[in-house]
């Protein structure tokens, strides 16, 4: 959470002389309350924007916009404090709009914007606009807050930002997963243009449950340069457990720019559709189960096995 580096922060507009200042998030009016204070912002609107830094990086920023109520309290409005709180880390960043001239009513509702808070992909924020001076203790609140969830790097707008590209967002593995038979799964994906290894994580689930019944990890060695952008295929051996039929395949790359923290891509194979009509019951019931294929477990290593190929 930081401010966009190279921009001259401007808040002046026709009819108002205004300057933007860094803030400690503790305005003086908390310590020295005033008798007359302005009302709260009318509407806060927040959306995501992408801006470039002075180093040419593209970063996600919050665009914050708000309007004033059309009451007489604008005569006592001396500015505004904008605060962005990252919900998980409790990190807070504030700026202060300082009005250097008195506000007057004019034919349009006063509107303010600020687009300099740099945020992180896949993070949750609370944005607060506090009109200044802040109210006396037990006075009516004169702030408004809104939450905002920054999309993750899979979002089209975010993919091209520098933090997302660093974590491998431009790689589209175009995964296809195919069930060959009850015991084999074929995974195809496109390799990226980097000589780095990949890991395939297979998690299987029963038809209607979210707790796994089988997990397997498969390592794919780094491809040679002539294999970049080619399709790679892997055949994974499944654990032969009845009903363990929904398979989630996740591919984890280890690119040099993100190492263990690269974006993972996944694909899921659903269980086969259940037939609408029940299986017919045979006319006779055998007194014993045939020995072959009777076990729920494979005879070999039940951790699963696999082999892979790169296709040119």
């Amino acid at each position: 959470l930081r401010l966009l580096d190279h921009r001259a922060l401007v808040c002046s507009q026709p009819g108002l002389n205004c300057t933007v200042k860094n803030s400690t998030c503790l305005d003086d009016s908390w310590i020295h309350p005033r008798n007359l204070t302005p009302s709260s912002p009318k509407n806060i609107y927040i959306n995501l924007s992408v801006s470039s830094t002075q180093h040419g990086e593209l970063v996600p920023v919050l665009h914050v916009e708000w309007t004033l109520q059309t009451d007489a309290s604008i005569l006592y409005l001396e500015g505004a404090e904008l605060s962005v709180l990252q919900l998980n880390t409790n990190e807070r960043l504030c700026v202060r709009f300082e009005f250097l001239s008195k506000l007057r009513h004019h034919h349009r509702r006063w509107r303010f914007t600020f687009s300099h808070f740099v945020v992180d992909p896949d993070q949750e924020y609370e944005v607060t606009v506090h009109h200044l001076p802040k109210p006396i203790p037990d006075g009516d609140p004169n702030h408004q807050s809104k939450n905002f969830l920054v999309p993750d790097c899979e979002h089209a707008r975010m993919k091209v930002t520098t933090p997302c590209m660093s974590s491998g967002s431009l790689w589209d593995p175009n995964i296809t997963v195919e069930t060959l038979d009850t015991q084999h799964l074929r995974v195809d994906f496109t390799l990226w243009n980097e000589s780095t290894h990949y890991q395939i994580l297979l998690t299987s689930f029963p038809h209607m449950e979210n707790h796994s019944c089988f997990e397997h990890m498969h390592h794919i060695p780094a491809p040679r340069p002539e294999e970049f952008h080619q399709r790679s295929n892997v055949t994974l051996t499944l654990r032969n457990l009845k009903g363990c039929c929904r398979h989630q395949v996740q591919i984890q790359p280890f690119f040099s720019s993100c190492l263990n923290d690269c974006l993972r891509h996944s694909a899921t194979v659903s269980c086969p559709e259940m037939p609408d009509t029940p299986e017919p019951i045979p006319d006779y019931m055998p007194l014993w189960e045939p020995r072959s294929g009777s076990s729920d477990y494979k005879d070999d290593d039940d951790k699963g096995s696999s082999h892979h190929h790169h296709h040119h």
Epitope: T89, E124, K146, L149
Partner: antibody, heavy 116, light 107 residues
């Protein structure tokens, strides 16, 4: 694979307290907040609050303020929700979920029955 | 607090058909809306957030339209695993609030 595994069902008497645990795996607990949501039998979902395992910061729904405490133990990657002064209308399935706004992974739920 | 209202309470649809679920907020919530699916005896599962972004692993047949106060979840072609209860939830301001749910059942 991200998983949140909750403690087992509890039966409590009115006035008692209950403490539900939620063990996270497949990710670092401090990377995201943990929210708690409950669902009374046959009813909808009710948000109770959240805790940031990173900062310890909490936010509780006004309805539960003073009666609920959310904590985390990062050494065991576990979040806890304690609800005190239980009443019969606190009978519900209590869920923990990852994140604070849009809740992307949920525990399997813990049924808490309050009955005399 | 913001009140979320879902309609209809129950929706009867045949497999392969399109389902349209409605969610209304008592005041504008921009695009700060999430949709969840819940099957009997299971926890809810996040489908969509930001009113239109599908969560990881959610098929493209699930989509949302709307912003402000009116939202619509569309399931383009219902599969057998889609019959469940669907909840909307706003995260624009505290407290987070959920709609009462729409049950999608087999016609």
């Amino acid at each position: 694979q991200v998983q949140l595994v909750q403690s087992g069902a509890e039966v409590k008497k009115p006035g008692a307290s209950v403490k539900v645990s939620c063990k996270a795996s497949g990710y670092t607990l401090t990377s995201y907040g943990i929210s708690w949501v409950r669902q009374a039998p046959g009813q909808g979902l009710e948000w109770m609050g959240w805790i940031s395992a990173y900062s310890g910061n909490t936010k509780y729904a006004q309805k539960f303020q003073g009666r609920v405490t959310m904590t985390t133990d990062t050494s065991t990657s576990t979040a806890y929700m304690e609800l005190r002064s239980l009443r019969s209308d606190d009978t519900a399935v209590y869920y923990c979920a990852r994140r604070q706004l849009a809740l992307d992974y949920w525990g399997q739920g813990t049924l808490v029955t309050v009955s005399s | 607090e913001i009140v979320m209202t879902q309609s209809p309470a129950t929706l009867s649809v045949s497999p392969g058909e399109r389902a349209t679920l409605s969610c209304r907020a008592s005041q504008s919530i921009s695009s700060n809306l999430a949709w969840y699916q819940q099957k009997p005896g299971q926890a809810p599962r996040l489908l969509i957030y930001g009113a239109s972004t599908r969560a990881t692993g959610i098929p493209a047949r699930f989509s949302d339209n709307g912003s402000g106060t009116e939202f619509t979840l569309t399931i383009s072609s219902l599969q057998s695993e889609d019959f469940a209860v669907y909840f909307c939830q706003q995260y624009d301001t505290w407290p987070l609030t959920f709609g009462g749910g729409t049950k999608v059942e087999i016609k």
